[in-house]
Interface confidence: low
């Protein structure tokens, strides 16, 4: 997946719903990444993706402090960034984008959520003149119903992603339970 022609094209944003009446305060807190799909994501059956968690903290200016906690190389890895509110509630851009070399645009759109159990979030970025997109299935717990997973698969497919670009990270205990 390292040349432009290899990447599945990002879908038009008209095919990506936006959660109606998005409640930024209710979206706060920890979300486990139960599902992950994207044009730069490939399922590796021999080395499956480990689950990670992302914490959303609302700041006074209504942007989010976003921290992802990953278990990598036998230690906890923290990835921190800021999501700044975009054109409409539930849509965000990346704060301080100029500090990320090669990154020219970054969009986050909350597709759907019920806040206390599950969410689907769409991400699109242009980096080194290549357009990447991904969808995350978030859960407040590490397990979600098969119906929600099937819905996630269907949505990912509707954006042009085949099965091998859709993964369900393996639940772990390290780092993400704190």
């Amino acid at each position: 997946q390292d040349s432009t022609s290899d990447l599945i094209p990002a879908p038009p944003l008209s095919k990506v719903p936006l959660q109606q009446n998005f409640q930024d305060n209710q979206f706060q807190g920890k979300w486990y990444v139960v599902g992950l799909a994207g044009n730069a994501i490939l399922r590796e059956d021999k080395d499956p993706q480990k689950m990670y968690a992302t914490i959303y903290e609302l700041k006074e200016d209504k942007s989010y402090n976003v921290t992802s906690v990953l278990f990598r190389k036998k230690k906890c890895d923290y990835w921190i960034r800021t999501f700044v509110p975009g054109c409409q509630p539930g849509e965000f851009t990346l704060g301080n984008i100029k500090s990320y070399p090669g990154l020219t645009s970054y969009l986050v759109r909350v597709v759907s959520t019920n806040y206390n159990q599950h969410a689907m979030v769409f991400f699109k970025k242009v980096s080194q003149n290549r357009e990447y997109f991904k969808i995350t299935l978030y859960g407040r717990t590490k397990e979600l119903t098969s119906e929600l997973k099937e819905n996630f698969i269907r949505f990912s497919k509707s954006l042009g992603l085949p099965e091998n670009h859709i993964v369900f990270p393996v639940p772990i205990d390290q780092c993400i339970d704190g």
Epitope: P17, Q19, N151, R154, K157, S158
Partner: antibody
Amino acid sequence: VHLQQSGSELRSPGSSVKLSCKDFDSEVFPIAYMSWVRQKPGHGFEWIGDILPSIGRTNYGEKFEDKATLDADTVSNTAYLDLNSLTSEDSAIYYCARSRFEDYFDYWGQGTTLTVSS
Amino acid sequence: QIVLTQSPAIMSASPGEKVTMTCSASSSVSYIHWYQQKSGTSPKRWIFDTSKLASGVPARFSGSGSGTSYSLTISSMEAEDAATYYCQQWRTNPLTFGAGTKLEIK
């Protein structure tokens, strides 16, 4: 019944008409795409366009860009199709059809017959 | 736009006979979906994601294919299967349908 469409319409050439489609699934309506599709007698289907009610974003088939206007009301969970400058060529059955996250339709309305005649 | 060509346009089959109809796309698509329409009624989702049967569809129906070539098969024709079947794609806008295959009972 998931999608309930308005009744048959008879219109004169040059006039306009507004068709409606009510979705009884209020949870799904705002985040589902509502498409409009027309079927002429003895013919296949033509996709007119779709709307995402939560943000009012629309897509139109090229043929219908100047003919159709899509709208939606998330309070009444109703989608609308406006057709202008009607001619006899616009006589057809018009269906609303819903697509959730998928690229197919899970439900169709019962259809509205539009007859354009002088 | 992606053009879907269905064949045959009209066909008839005796009860118990195996039926196959095809849908050919002008360029590659990820999935094809099929709808059944009977005279005077609105279409019903019949087969989606190429091969998955919609709720209530008899197991004698199946769908298959990939790329530009897809098909719908009925393993053993029954009178209630007489209808027009349409294929559909939405890989790109505009969404397009095939012209339909009308299946009659002999």
